[in-house]
Structures are given as C-alpha cells and as structure tokens.
Amino acid sequence: VKMAETCPIFYDVFFAVANGNELLLDLSLTKVNATEPERTAMKKIQDCYVENGLISRVLDGLVMTTISSSKDCMGEAVQNTVEDLKLNTLGR
Amino acid sequence: EICPAVKRDVDLFLTGTPDEYVEQVAQYKALPVVLENARILKNCVDAKMTEEDKENALSVLDKIYTSPLC
C-alpha cells in the first residue's frame, strides 16, 4: 500500500502491463498522455508477460513488490516523511 | 516520488543486458525460479523491441516520473 502512495501512476501502469489486460493498459496509457509509438512499445512489453503465462506475471509482480517494500525503498520513504515533517514544522 | 531502486530495476529491464538485469533482481529475490523468469522476460523484451521502441518506453516512464501523481 505504502509503495503505491509514493507514485501511484507508476504502479497503475506496471500492474496493467504485468497482468496482461490490454484494456487496463490502454486506460493507464491514456492517463499519462502516451503517444501512438509509446503505446505500441508498452504493448510489446505486455506481450512478453502474456506469452509467458500467469506464473511469469505473478513472479514479476512479486519482484516489483519485494523491491518496492525493501529497505532501499522503505528507508527512502521514511526519510522523505521525516523531511516532510521538518518542513511542516518549520512552516508553522 | 518513485523509489530509485524501482527506477533502476525498470531502466535495466529496458536498457541493460540480461545479465545486468538478472543480477539486479537477485539483490532482492534470489530464488532460481524468479531469476529464470526475469531472464525469460528480459530476453523476450530484447527480441521484440527495437531501439526506437525502447526509447518510446523510456519516454512513457519519463512522463510517469514527472507526473503530479508521482
């Protein structure tokens, strides 16, 4: 949950690509104003997930979730929260 | 803002070699089945996508990273 808060549109696009649903990918690409060549490129990536089946999609989703919730990312999120708190406190 | 580790993972998926990408994944999930899957996906993307396709995919990522929702 925390990871999606940091950049929701990224996870929107990533999971649309990885779950193989082209309709959701089309919607995600509209949200970022993707051009025709950009749409074509992203659909080629999605094709790889579709061709390699459900297990492939689950495993890569697991990788992304693991990286996003790793100390490398969570440490950063905590640091950002601390910085935000400092700024808010100073701003009062 | 997107976490740099996530950004690095995605950048290597598009622009790195299969070995570089799998090595990056291994830092977070060293299960053989996960690493084999990562290599299969990376090889597939390299086979399907032209350099221009990869530039366009990176352009989408750039739009994502500069979005107000990131």
């Epitope: 649903n21 082209e22 309709l23 089309d26 919607l27 509209t30 025709e36 749409r39 074509t40 | -």
Partner: antibody, heavy 115, light 107 residues
Framework: EVQLVESGGGLVQPGGSLRLSCAAS????????MHWVRQAPGKGLEWVSS????????DHADSVKGRFTISRDNSKNTLYLQMNSLRAEDTAVYYC????????WGQGTLVTVSS | DIQMTQSPSSLSASVGDRITITCRAS??????LAWFQQKPGKAPKSLIY???SLQSGVPSKFSGSGSGTDFTLTISSLQPEDFATYYC?????????FGPGTKVDIK
C-alpha cells in the same frame, strides 16, 4: 482528421438483435481502445462497452452484460456492437468514441426497441 | 462503481455571465475527469480532460479545476452558443460514469 461514423441503427422488436458498426479514419485505429456510449431520449449519457486496441480485452456495463458484445476488425478500421435480447430500455442514440475521456465522437445512430 | 453528481441540475443565465458547474465523485479519481458540452440533437463535444486541460480548439473562456472528488467547470463570459447541457465523466476506472448533466439556458 479523426472521423467516426456509426451505422446499423433502426427499429427492432423486443427480444430482437441488431449489429452496430463504427467506421474510423484519421488515426492508427489499432493503437486505441474504443468505446460505445448511449443516450436514451431526453436522458443523460451512459457508458456501454469498451474494447482494447488489439481486441484482447473488453468490458461492458452491467445493464448490457450477457446481451451485448463489443468487437473490432482492425484490418477494416471498424468497431462493432452486437446487441441481442434487446429491451425497450435499450432505446437510445448509440455513439462510438475514441480514448477513455471520449475525445472524439461519432454522430450517433438511433436504436428503437418497440413492438 | 464510482457515482458522479452534478450541481446545479439546471441554471438560467444571461449573455456575459460567469457561471460555475460543480461535479463530485463518490471516491477519489485523482484528476481523471472530463467535461462535455451537448446541444440538442448533436453528439457531445469534448471540452476538458485531466480535470483542467483544454481540448484543442476549445476557447479559453472554458476552464476546469479540481482533483480528488470535487471539480468545477467555469465559463468566464457566457455567449449565445454556450447555452447547452454540460456533463462530467470519470475515467479513473471501469465502469466509466457520467454526471447527470447541467442544463444552461437563457434567463
């Protein structure tokens, strides 16, 4: 210039079928999801169906699920809506539209379901 | 499903007036909101997408704002051709949903 032209509307009896078509031009048809939206006489707009760029996935409003099927033929740049088991409440002008915020619309085709 | 509500349902205004129409979503839709204008017997015309981005060819007297659940469409100086029905629509997620519309007529 993007152009969308619907056809296939008409008068049909309850329980009957109809197939609507939407001919598209002025853009790379297969790159975009396409959508059907309808408007009953004197009423507001209602989303009906959507289909992904290459036709891999689709979705339908609950009110038409199991009765309507959206499809596309990218070689003909044409979108379709197969409507079966039609009811009086399906009477409406049917529009096809491009992109999820419905940037471009066709002129609409009227479907009247009446005995 | 995300419900969209609009207020007012109708309003009477004069040429030159500044008017504001409000649209509310039943849950957070970020800025994934579009506005349309429709005249009787015609197809809807896209005015705004992304809550505030003006569609090409749409005059700058139209402006949109808001994010999350509350949005507004403003027409800065109403002209005779602006008397129509206005709809909002969310494209945050399927199923896409429209507001019930706001009819703007001449006072």
């Amino acid at each position: 210039e993007v152009q969308l032209v619907e056809s296939g509307g008409g008068l049909v009896q309850p329980g009957g079928s109809l197939r609507l078509s939407c001919a598209a031009s002025g853009f790379t048809f297969s790159t975009y999801a396409m959508h059907w939206v309808r408007q009953a006489p004197g009423k507001g707009l209602e989303w009906v169906s959507s289909i992904s760029g290459r036709g891999r996935n689709s979705d339908h409003a609950d009110s038409v699920k199991g009765r309507f099927t959206i499809s596309r033929d990218n070689s003909k740049n044409t979108l379709y809506l197969q409507m079966n088991s039609l009811r009086a409440e399906d009477t409406a002008v049917y529009y096809c539209a491009r992109t999820e915020y419905f940037h471009h619309w066709g002129q609409g085709t009227l479907v009247t379901v009446s005995s | 499903d995300i419900q969209m509500t609009q207020s007012p349902s109708s309003l009477s205004a004069s040429v030159g007036d500044r008017i504001t129409i409000t649209c509310r979503a039943s849950q957070d839709i970020n800025n994934y909101l579009a506005w349309f204008q429709q005249k009787p017997g015609k197809a809807p015309k896209s005015l705004i997408y992304g809550a505030s981005s003006l569609q090409s060819g749409v005059p700058s007297k139209f402006s949109g704002s808001g994010s999350g659940t509350d949005f507004t469409l403003t027409i800065s100086s109403l002209q005779p051709e602006d008397f129509a029905t206005y709809y909002c629509q969310q494209y945050s997620s399927y199923p896409f949903t429209f507001g019930p519309g706001t009819k703007v007529d001449i006072k």
